[in-house]
């Protein structure tokens, strides 16, 4: 059995899935800001777990997903006060009783050292410095991201 | 109805210790971040610390860290703030608000506690 | 450390008389800026939050305006009530900091 907050990541992914496909993101739009092949919006308000997936979704966007250790550092050097939390895409899955990325895939526990409880209704939020688990009722600021698409140059053959 | 009772006020002498208890109820605890404001007699207000709704990040004041822990049981829907190595100068009345995260503002107070530094 | 410097520290005003309140910030703040009010023995009540949203339950004749470091609470016609002192705060960054306070006295 899913919890809420699971049917809602997969239904947002699923509506995602069924969109037509896009022209490749070659820049940010006008108030993102670029993170390497990403572009990241920190949101202003705040907002519950679920509320935010939905907000990113509305943008054409995700929450936020770290790949690895490197990615989180460089994030969390744009976050400008070690009072503010900001919630990513990553929740804890009651049914496989582990963290769980919006994307479906598991955490990999090398990745992030989080501070507090993997249970139900467990989400992740980052701030400057740390990784944490918080109630996903609690709301916090969210991080969207939209992928960059890599300029690959062109090789022509010889003439 | 959302309600903040604090307790643990008194008279405690310089280099002493006391804990404050800040109960709430009438709202999902666990979901807010929470703080300590003080007010030292016919003064302004001074934010003294803060704390994470599941408990695991903390934040202080410069003029209590070192000195002051901020906790909570969410169990017990219950704040805390230890206060060790008293000085005169943290005579005042301690309220506990909801809110903490930034931007949050306070939205509720309690009705504060006393505390008197003095020999 | 994000200093807040209110104008004037008291005033004297009659009911009906219409108050303006300014808060100052040392550097910008953005709308990051909240007023409470609170009268003798009790505890400072949240007024408005984020410059200028009403908090919930707070008459309409309180409002307020501003951005980036000058902020403004408007007591539209003055209130036996609203005889307090009235705090500005800024949520910014941290330390959290308030300003001196206003003691709105009746003329």
């Known amino acids: 059995q899913k919890s809420s907050i699971e049917k809602c990541s997969v239904d947002i992914q699923q509506s995602r899935n069924k969109t037509t496909e896009r022209p490749g993101l070659l820049n940010c739009p006008i108030y993102w800001q670029q993170l390497r092949e990403k572009c990241l919006l920190f949101s202003h308000t705040v907002n519950p777990w679920n509320n935010s997936l939905a907000d990113c979704s509305t943008k054409e966007s995700s929450l936020l997903l770290i790949r690895d250790k490197d990615e989180l550092i460089h994030t969390q050097n744009l976050i400008r006060d070690k009072a503010i939390l900001f919630w990513i895409g990553l929740n804890f899955s009651l049914s496989e009783k582990n963290w769980k990325w919006i994307n479906g895939s598991f955490l990999n526990s090398n990745d992030l050292e989080i501070r507090g409880d993997a249970k139900e209704n467990s989400c992740i939020s980052i701030s400057q410095t740390s990784v944490y688990s918080e109630y996903c009722s609690t709301e916090i600021r969210w991080i969207c991201q939209k992928e960059l698409t890599p300029v690959r140059n062109k090789v022509y053959p010889d003439s | 109805e959302v309600q903040l009772v604090e307790s643990g006020g008194g008279l405690v002498q310089p280099g002493g210790s006391l804990r404050l208890s800040c109960a709430a109820s009438g709202f999902t605890f666990s979901s807010y971040a929470m703080s300590w404001v003080r007010q030292a007699p016919g003064k302004g207000l001074e934010w003294v610390s803060a704390i994470s709704g599941s408990g695991g990040s903390t934040y202080y004041a410069d003029s209590v860290k070192g000195r002051f822990t901020i906790s909570r049981d969410n169990s017990k829907n219950t704040l805390y703030l230890q206060m060790n190595s008293l000085r005169a100068e943290d005579t005042a009345v301690y309220y506990c608000a909801r809110g903490g995260y930034l931007p949050d503002a306070f939205d509720y107070w309690g009705q504060g506690t006393l505390v008197t530094v003095s020999s | 450390d994000i200093q807040m410097t209110q104008s004037p520290s008291s005033l004297s005003a009659s009911v009906g008389d219409r108050v303006t309140i300014t808060c100052r910030a040392s550097q910008s703040i953005s709308s990051y800026l909240n007023w409470y009010q609170q009268k003798p023995g009790k505890a400072p009540k949240l007024l408005i939050y984020?410059?200028?949203s009403l908090q919930s339950g707070v008459p309409s004749r309180f409002s307020g305006s501003g951005s980036g470091t000058d902020f403004t609470l408007t007591i539209s016609s003055l209130q036996p009530e609203d005889f307090a002192t009235y705090y500005c705060q800024q949520t910014y960054s941290t330390p959290l900091t308030f300003g001196q306070g206003t003691k709105v006295e009746i003329k």
């Open positions: 984020a410059a200028s």
